[in-house]
Interface confidence: low
């Protein structure tokens, strides 16, 4: 057959769906690879063809659209499973073609099993809520397009295994779950089960997301440098190892880039000739406040190095701060025979 623009296997879009639930999968060609949509392609006389490769097989085969109750069907650029089965797992390909044009992409589909408490190998989206910040809401994700607006689904929310009913600070409001005040105790997995009728059958959609309660912006402060500080002096003799930690606390800030860096005599360590190494470690609190430590190390310090200015800098969306380390050369201990004797008037 003629050449086809093959976008390969799009592993960035690893699609996971639950067993025995409806799934609607849009052909990724129109979303991520081509500059036109399905309607335009269809009007131009292009046809969308679907096929698949079963798990652990090499053979591409057509999708069977003649299963009982139309279990698998195609509607425009969407492949429908009503519902999925475990052995639907595999790599699916959608190909757009006519006599002169061809473009295709494959993507992996994994049908996943869940237990009665909604535990599964499914990768869960994370929704961050600010601690003690007032009313915040999460919305049952990825349910658009499964049923028309005339259908009134029932939605049940669970935290872990438990149905949410009269929780002190969490209220189900249909597709929304309202956190009247988010607390650390609200951390966990929340599941919405959407039940809707279609052609005399009842379908369930299960969506689980992880709620992580994080530091509130009303409590956020600019970076705080705990070290270096005015109370610690790094006093070294030439030839000794100089170790200066720069320890900085960052309040949690959504989408903020936290940075810590050293300057030596106003320059970045990479831009100077001395043999400096910098090691960084990062730790997080329960509300995702961050503490970064960068240890500046000079293995064998020279007297010149001990005269330099060592400044720790930190920056977040809340501001930028800097603190100089107090570095000095250790005064050698007096040699008894000379200095001490002089003190007694010896000549």
């Amino acid at each position: 057959s003629e050449r086809c623009d093959d976008w390969g296997l799009d592993t960035m879009r690893q699609i996971q769906v639950f067993e025995d639930e409806p799934a609607r999968i849009k052909c990724p060609l129109f979303e991520h690879f081509l500059k036109f949509n399905y309607s335009t392609a269809h009007s131009a006389g292009l046809t969308l063809i679907w096929y698949w490769t079963r798990q652990d097989r090499d053979l591409e085969e057509p999708i069977n659209f003649r299963l009982p109750e139309n279990r698998i069907s195609k509607e425009k650029d969407v492949l429908w499973f009503r519902p999925t089965l475990l052995n639907d797992t595999g790599n699916y390909t959608c190909m757009l073609r006519n006599t002169t044009y061809c473009s295709k992409v494959a993507f992996p589909l994994e049908v996943v099993q869940k237990d009665s408490c909604f535990n599964s190998p499914m990768k869960l989206p994370v929704h961050k809520l600010y601690i003690e910040y007032g009313i915040q809401r999460i919305t049952c994700p990825n349910v658009d397009g499964y049923f028309p607006s005339s259908v009134k689904p029932t939605i049940t929310w669970y935290m872990g295994c438990y149905k949410i009913q009269n929780f002190n600070n969490v209220i189900p409001e249909g597709m929304n779950l309202s956190f009247l005040i988010a607390l650390i105790s609200n951390n966990g997995n929340y599941t919405c089960v959407v039940t809707y009728p279609e052609n005399g059958r009842t379908f369930h959609l299960t969506r689980t997301l992880t709620v992580k309660v994080v530091g509130s912006p009303k409590n956020a402060v600019p970076p705080v440098i705990h070290s270096p500080n005015d109370h610690v002096v790094y006093e070294k003799e030439p030839g000794e190892e100089l170790l200066i930690p720069c320890t900085v606390y960052f309040s949690f800030l959504m989408d903020s880039r936290n940075e810590v860096w050293w300057t030596i005599d106003g320059k970045k360590p990479d831009d100077i000739t001395i043999d400096v190494t910098i090691n960084e470690s990062i730790s997080h609190s329960r509300t995702e406040d961050e503490t970064r430590t960068q240890i500046l190390s000079i293995k064998k310090v020279t007297s010149e190095d001990l005269k330099r200015s060592y400044v720790c800098h930190a920056r977040s969306a809340k501001g930028e701060v800097a603190k100089a380390a107090k570095v000095k050369q250790k005064v050698p201990a007096p040699r008894y025979t000379v200095e001490l004797a002089c003190g007694f008037g010896a000549t």
Epitope: G134, I135, I155, E173, G174, S178, L180, I181
Partner: antibody, heavy 118, light 110 residues
């Protein structure tokens, strides 16, 4: 900053109709449940009704005194909530407040005065 | 006649602690969270307490809420002149399928 602003209040004769609007901003209106609460002059607060978000079916609930006469609707493209009031009675005279939420009314507008009098 | 019962008035002197009660039944306060609203003279109501004893940001911790069975109460400690207002309790009512309010309590700071 969350804001809800009512408009459309005024004087109307008994049996007449009036439509109140509520313009919302500062939050994802399409996902929010919205409610109307009223307050007759010198009296307490009275819940009128609520509308769920479209994703929750967009269904409405009404207090018994207004059921069948009042209709709550929404236009998510305009971030606007409406209260259509028909067959108005003198006892419907009140300040009408638009509020966010279906159970917990976290933000309120300044209110729109509706006077039903001949 | 309101579904939730509140005393029509309450009073206290500056610095004092006052409590406003709100009584309901199993289909409202007994089953659902209680909200308290403050309405200062000539202004729109403002959410004061929700879900037993949670305060929106900006509400001083002098205001606290509690709930026991089918009754709830609002306590204001260290009373200040600016607390003079009408206070309303509210809850969802299962049997009426709607939100019910108390009749309101007028608080006077003497």
């Amino acid at each position: 900053e969350v804001q809800v602003v009512e408009s459309g209040g005024g004087l109307v004769k008994p049996g007449g109709s009036l439509r109140l609007s509520c313009a919302a901003s500062g939050f994802i209106f399409s996902k929010a449940w919205m409610s109307w609460v009223r307050q007759a002059p010198g009296k307490g607060l009275e819940w009128v009704g609520r509308i769920k978000s479209k994703t929750d079916g967009g269904t409405t609930d009404y207090a018994a005194p207004v059921k069948g006469r009042f209709t709550i609707s929404r236009d998510d493209s305009k971030n606007t909530l409406y209260l259509q009031m028909n067959s108005l009675k003198t006892e419907d005279t009140a300040v009408y407040y638009c509020t966010t939420g279906g159970y917990v009314f976290d933000y309120w507008g300044q209110g729109a005065l509706v006077t039903v009098s001949s | 006649q309101s579904v939730l019962t509140q005393p029509p008035s309450a009073s206290g002197t500056p610095g004092q602690r006052v409590t406003i009660s709100c009584s309901g039944n199993n289909s409202n306060i007994g089953s659902y969270i209680v909200n308290w609203f403050q309405q200062l003279p000539g202004t729109a109501p403002k959410l004061l307490i929700y879900s037993k004893n949670q305060r929106p940001s900006g509400v001083p911790d002098r205001f606290s809420g509690s709930k026991s069975g089918t009754s709830a109460s609002l306590a204001i400690s260290g009373l200040q002149s600016e607390d003079e207002a009408d206070y309303y309790c509210a809850a969802w009512d299962d049997s009426l399928n709607g939100v019910v309010f108390g009749g309101g309590t007028k608080l006077t700071v003497l």
